[in-house]
């Protein structure tokens, strides 16, 4: 913590300006009034403060606003945002997308994924839902940031907004996030024709249940291997060799390349070797001929 000293009369600060860059840390602490700083935050980012000086300014604001900064201050944080921790940001209430844009721009090129994720979370809470304007802002200023949101926050996305999400925005989404987004996408795109539908739904398919994947196999979609590899393991395992062949079409040859990787490896182990041989790809590891397959999971459910 910065030592408390009294401010020399000649150093008294009446406005936030460039003269402050010559102040030592203890002088800034003693001479800058926190309320003045808050009122003139829009000037701070234009002044080339050192990181040490920014620490002092942050400390001033923390003392003035122990419950969290108001949005009028947050909007003008500029490079001071780089000093914020997720714990600081968690106290904020942010509703303006201009504030979000400003801080996303500042964070670019810095390792601030945790802070940005927390900021986006606060914006979603502040605005009540992940509306189209918020999604548009995220996709424009922070590709991939959508996936930093928790499944709980993503559940506030209305299906009507899903069309604004681009494939690259979902690249870092995990299964739990896709579980939330996929049913919304299916609802949002349900009025499209088969081929157009598949193009739209493809980035979300990591959240699809088996029955949806089976249905796709009946529609000549020729799913690429990258999409197939992102399907949930549990959705792939019940598929027959014939269904996978129809699903992948000409891309079925790619199974050989992915033979040792999940979900392909796990799927191979569940198929009869005879059936795998019909693909002519040399896939090995299937159930040998003459073996009986007992599905104990269904038996357990019945008992």
């Amino acid at each position: 913590d910065v030592e408390r000293t009294t401010c020399p009369p000649e150093k008294e600060v009446h406005e936030i300006d460039e003269s402050l860059i010559f102040y030592k840390k203890r002088e800034l602490e003693a001479c800058v009034d926190a309320a003045l700083l808050a009122a003139q935050m829009d000037r701070v980012d234009a002044i080339p403060f050192t990181y040490e000086q920014l620490d002092v300014l942050k400390h001033k604001l923390d003392e003035l606003y122990p419950q969290g900064y108001p949005e009028s201050v947050i909007r003008h944080l500029g490079h001071l945002f780089l000093k914020m921790s997720p714990e600081d940001i968690r106290k904020w209430n942010v509703t303006s997308l201009e504030t979000l844009k400003a801080l996303l721009k500042v964070s670019k090129g810095h390792e601030m994924s945790a802070q940005v994720a927390t900021l986006i979370d606060r914006v979603v809470v502040g605005r009540g839902q992940l509306d189209k304007d918020t999604v548009d802002t995220l996709t424009a200023f922070c590709p991939g940031c959508l996936c930093s949101l928790s499944p709980e926050r993503l559940s506030s996305v209305p299906p009507s907004v899903i069309g604004a999400v681009r494939p690259q925005d979902l690249d870092t989404c995990g299964p739990r996030q896709l579980d939330v987004l996929y049913p919304k996408a299916r609802l949002a795109f349900q009025n499209m024709s088969g081929s157009e539908y598949f193009v739209k739904i493809r980035p979300f398919l990591g959240g699809a249940p088996t029955e949806d994947v089976k249905a796709l196999s009946q529609q000549n979609v020729s799913m690429d291997l990258a999409t197939f590899m992102k399907l949930r393991r549990e959705a792939v395992l019940p598929l027959t060799v014939a269904e996978v062949q129809k699903l992948l079409g000409p891309h079925v040859e790619g199974l050989k390349v992915e033979e040792q990787h999940s979900p392909v490896r796990d799927w191979i182990l569940k198929q009869r070797q005879d059936d795998l041989d019909t693909l002519g790809l040399g896939l090995q590891g299937g159930i040998p001929n003459g073996y009986l397959i007992l599905d104990l999971s269904v038996r357990e459910a019945l008992s």
Epitope: P151, S155, P159, S160, P175, R176, D179, V180, P183, R186, L187, F189, Q190, N191, Y197, I201, G207, P209, T210, E211, D212, K214, A215, L216, Q218, Q219, E234, A235, P238, S297, V298, A301, L302
Partner: antibody
Framework: QVQLQESGPGLVKPSETLSLTCTVS????????WSWVRQPPGKGLEWIGY???????NANPSLKSRVIISVDTSKNQFSLKLSSVTAADTAVYYC????????????????WGRGTLVTVSS | EIVMTQSPATLSVSPGERATLSCRAS??????LAWYQQKPGQAPRLLIY???TRATGIPARFSGSGSGTEFTLTISSLQSEDFAVYYC?????????FGQGTRLEIK
């Protein structure tokens, strides 16, 4: 073939929590979305919400604050908890399977349990 | 929320005759509409989805039509087992909503 069976107490006191379980037999719970729908005596149907086997849920906004839907894949079951019940929650509660095929891409129900009547009364 | 309104509330028709049931949505649901049949003490049974596609095992006398906000379920020649309550349901948006039902009774 796949069958659904609801179970739980038929009588719940006002302000308490209604708890029901749906057991899926003859197939895996992992393949579809599963919903709860209710029907007050002599009235129409009301969708409560759905769950995916991973635990992802979506509920009717009119009930969302009181509803918890959960899943137990090891038992092939999913459950409904409705808190702070009143007489208006007296209904036959159905569990149902959402069709879930992209070929028809719809949120409608092709398989239902028989339903269980839950009465809210002191 | 999309409100579904069915009419009439009760329809009296003689066996062998044609029955026409209506369902109106408060806003467009495209063709994302299903019809169910429910008999006393039983769960609903899916009849039609996509406004006009018959579900598996449903007799050809049941047909659906319409899109947007106006939908019709037609039963061409009523059999004794068709007397029941019929519900429409939209799945164009959440929350999924049902009509209040039309009771089809023997005249």
């Amino acid at each position: 073939q796949v069958q659904l069976q609801e179970s739980g107490p038929g009588l719940v006191k006002p302000s308490e929590t209604l708890s029901l379980t749906c057991t899926v037999s003859g197939g895996s719970i992992q393949n579809y979305y599963w919903s709860w729908v209710r029907q007050p005596p002599g009235k129409g149907l009301e969708w409560i919400g759905y769950i995916f086997y991973s635990g992802s849920t979506n509920a009717n906004p009119s009930l969302k604050s009181r509803v918890i839907i959960s899943v137990d894949t090891s038992k092939n079951q999913f459950s409904l908890k409705l808190s702070s019940v009143t007489a208006a929650d007296t209904a036959v509660y159905y569990c149902a399977r959402e069709v879930g095929r992209i070929a028809v891409a719809g949120w409608f129900f092709d398989l239902w349990g028989r339903g269980t009547l839950v009465t809210v009364s002191s | 929320e999309i409100v579904m309104t069915q009419s009439p509330a009760t329809l009296s028709v003689s066996p062998g005759e044609r029955a026409t049931l209506s369902c109106r949505a408060s806003q467009s649901v495209n063709a994302n509409l299903a019809w169910y049949q429910q008999k006393p003490g039983q769960a609903p049974r899916l009849l039609i989805y996509g406004a006009s596609t018959r579900a598996t095992g449903i007799p050809a006398r049941f047909s659906g039509s319409g899109s947007g906000t106006e939908f019709t379920l037609t039963i061409s020649s009523l059999q004794s087992e068709d007397f029941a309550v019929y519900y429409c349901q939209q799945y164009n948006n959440w929350p999924l909503t049902f009509g209040q039902g039309t009771r089809l009774e023997i005249k």
